[in-house]
Amino acid sequence: ITQQDLAPQQRAAPQQKRSSPSEGLCPPGHHISEDGRDCISCKYGQDYSTHWNDLLFCLRCTRCDSGEVELSPCTTTRNTVCQCEEGTFREEDSPEMCRKCRTGCPRGMVKVGDCTPWSDIECVHKESGTKHSGEVPAVEETVTSSPGTPASPCS
């Protein structure tokens, strides 16, 4: 999903909604007119603005991708909130797509965290309790390495 919010204003903006800019800015849910003299409302379900601003256009609402569920719809002051479907998650370093959660931990590890829309299952080493990092086989049954040798996706 693509989301583009306005930078929060550094100053306290007047709180009443009005049809003309206040201190050069328009309230959330509006953008400024091309002559800078009026505040124009965003179109519900089409675009939005989240902060006091002097943008000449509102920001386009995000459309949830297939594989995502819509948690809350786009309003004139808030973008659509999309979430990965059950059994999938979105990582911070690859936010463009939902990935399938692993169904189990590698041999010698135990699950300590469930699959959530924001994270894969979490596995730790049975003895040390340290987290596992890196790519791992999807389920325990696929591990074929002999006892004592580290699990490897290439073995």
């Epitope: 800019p21 002097d54 943008l55 000449l56």
Partner: antibody, heavy 112, light 110 residues
């Protein structure tokens, strides 16, 4: 649009540049300040809206203050350093049409 | 603040040739972008606004295009008088995002 007040100053000495306009009303337009160091590109400093609200580039906050009267717009350099040596331009800014009327610029040299 | 990335930094073309300058915004500005021409010792002159609208008195050899984050200034049938530095600047959200200019493109006409 015409700028004035540029001169040689020593570091740390506050300096105010003034932009005087004729032929249009400052109360109906936003005005922008831009500078250009010798041999360098244009650098946006900040602007002041028709209702006298001033906004600044993040690097310029605290270093400059923009204010206006009915016919002039002032740019105050609070504590100039040698890096502030540049030609300073004042211009009329319109929201959709950009910066359409520019002054010739005024040179500020900061040197000890 | 918004960041405007302009390429190339310099370009050299013969008289009669064509120059293309690109400007990329770090966030969408719709079509609210202006192009300026500056010659040594002079203030900038607005050439184009709203991405593609020619300012008064600017010859039609200058053409602006683009929207969102990617914009282009094309100068065709180059003349000696076109030798200058060209800058792009966003016009939407100046208080919200700032109005940083692109780094500039020096056009040399051979």
């Amino acid at each position: 649009v015409e700028e004035s007040g540029g001169r040689l100053v020593t570091p740390g000495t506050p300096l105010t540049l003034t932009c005087t306009v004729s032929g249009f009303s400052i109360s109906r337009y936003a005005m922008i300040w831009v500078r250009q160091a010798p041999g360098e590109g244009l650098e946006y400093i900040g602007f002041i809206t028709s209702d006298s609200s001033a906004y600044y580039a993040s690097w310029a906050k605290g270093r400059f203050t923009i204010s206006k009267t009915s016919t002039t717009v002032d740019l105050k350099m609070t504590s100039p350093t040698t890096e502030d040596t540049a030609t300073y331009f004042c211009a009329r800014y319109t929201y959709s049409d950009g910066t359409d009327l520019w002054g010739p610029g005024t040179l500020v040299t900061v040197s000890s | 603040d918004i960041v405007m990335t302009q390429t190339p930094a310099s370009v050299s073309e013969p008289v009669g040739g064509t120059v293309t300058i690109k400007c990329q915004a770090s966030q969408s500005i719709s079509t609210y972008l202006s192009w300026y021409q500056q010659k040594p010792g002079q203030p900038p002159k607005r050439l184009i606004y709203k991405a593609s609208t020619l300012a008064s008195g600017v010859p039609s050899r200058f053409k602006g295009s683009g929207s969102g984050t990617d914009f282009t200034l094309t100068i065709r049938d180059l003349e000696c008088a076109d030798a200058a530095t060209y800058y792009c600047q966003p016009n939407s959200g100046i208080a919200t995002y700032g109005a940083a200019f692109g780094g500039g493109t020096e056009v040399v006409v051979k």
